[in-house]
Interface confidence: medium
Amino acid sequence: LPAQVAFTPYAPEPGSTCRLREYYDQTAQMCCSKCSPGQHAKVFCTKTSDTVCDSCEDSTYTQLWNWVPECLSCGSRCSSDQVETQACTREQNRICTCRPGWYCALSKQEGCRLCAPLRKCRPGFGVARPGTETSDVVCKPCAPGTFSNTTSSTDICRPHQICNVVAIPGNASMDAVCTSTSPTRSMAPGAVHLPQPVSTRSQHTQPTPEPSTAPSTSFLLPMGPSPPAEGSTGD
């Protein structure tokens, strides 16, 4: 790696490109410094002066190295069915995720736009597929020999108890009732619960600043434009 850094702005010669954390300014026709996350370009570079950066104002952010004239607005506050898993800072947007017992019915780039309560399976029905962060519960009718007597988003169909002498046969929504002789069970007694979906979304971290494509090797001047959008420009 270079032991020193060339000062910006500078003109890229044909066949070479601006380096990491620099952008090509079409007006100045120079490689100029990008602003760091949490900042934006207050004054664009010229042939003789580099980009002047300034901190983002409250409730605004930039997450990437950028040259946008204004920081992006943080999203609105989380609704009552959501929890704030990442606060709005100068370097990151607010992230809202659904609280326990809810799932994301309409997602956005990060977090959730619209949460909905997890479906509850009524008696006679059990959970076939548990709810996740982004999908609802799927219920299924309890098969013969099994039942569910709860209204629940986590309970599955359980086997009827096996009686030596049956007092009342079980059905899809009720367990069998045995006479006073002690019953046996094919499974341990008590409701079988599926775990609630737990938010596993980790906090977004800044990607490693490496070029993802081989640099341009065109000899043409000026160099091709890069869209000056903070969200679309990496390090």
Partner: antibody, heavy 119, light 111 residues
């Protein structure tokens, strides 16, 4: 490691032709612009010609324009310099060099091949 | 006559500091194009010493440093050593010539 190996130099009469080759290895050849630089005996360095990574764009010094043609075969990782209508003043050691992707400059050079134009 | 102007020779005693200047124009150094410096030891190919005005490639000792101001640039060598005796060339891109240009070269003699 990066290696550039020139070949094709030799003695040629004025008005004659010669084709120099530069075999490259140790790097992604298509990702780099390449160039030819020459040095007359006892003199300084003179840039001759350059070509973009894909081969679409070529540049020439005024002193060789219309006589020399630079090209590359990316499938063979080889750079070429076709030299026609050679003159005595073209006598020099010809170096092929790789252009640095960022900021510029020629970061790797071959050992050179001597071209002598004489009757 | 070279587009970039360098002194033909400079000299210094071991341990001393020497500088080599490189003067261009508004179409090369003054236009903002990077200045690159090469060292050529006798009988060998040139070696990149400084690129983009001030960058030292890995392996180049920090005794070598580059500077640029306006239409000129310079190479400074501190703690001069016998093995520094070589020819030094500056180089830049020239927009009016649409090509790369070199200085005439400077011969450094270590006394």
């Amino acid at each position: 490691q990066v290696q550039l190996l020139e070949s094709g130099g030799g003695l040629v009469q004025p008005g004659g032709s010669l084709r120099l080759s530069c075999a490259a290895s140790g790097f992604s050849f298509t990702s780099y612009a390449m160039t030819w630089v020459r040095q007359a005996p006892g003199k300084g360095l003179e840039w001759v010609s350059g070509i973009s990574g894909g081969g679409a764009a070529t540049f020439y010094a005024d002193s060789v324009k219309g006589r020399f043609t630079i090209s590359r075969d990316n499938s063979k990782n080889t750079l070429y310099l076709q030299m026609n209508s050679l003159r005595a003043e073209d006598t020099a050691v010809y170096y092929c060099a790789r252009q640095s992707q960022y900021v510029g400059g020629f970061d790797y050079w071959g050992q050179g091949t001597l071209v002598t134009v004489s009757s | 006559q070279s587009v970039l102007t360098q002194p033909p020779s400079v000299s210094g005693a071991p341990g001393q500091r020497v500088t080599i200047s490189c003067t261009g124009s508004s179409s090369n150094i003054g236009a903002g194009y990077g200045v690159h410096w090469y060292q050529q030891l006798p009988g060998t190919a040139p070696k990149l010493l400084i690129h983009g005005n001030t960058n030292r490639p890995s392996g180049v000792p920090d005794r070598f440093s580059g500077f640029k101001s306006g239409t000129s640039a310079s190479l400074a060598i501190t703690g001069l050593q016998a093995e520094d005796e070589a020819d030094y060339y500056c180089q830049s891109y020239d927009s009016s010539l649409s090509g790369w240009v070199f200085g005439g070269g400077t011969k450094l003699t270590v006394l």
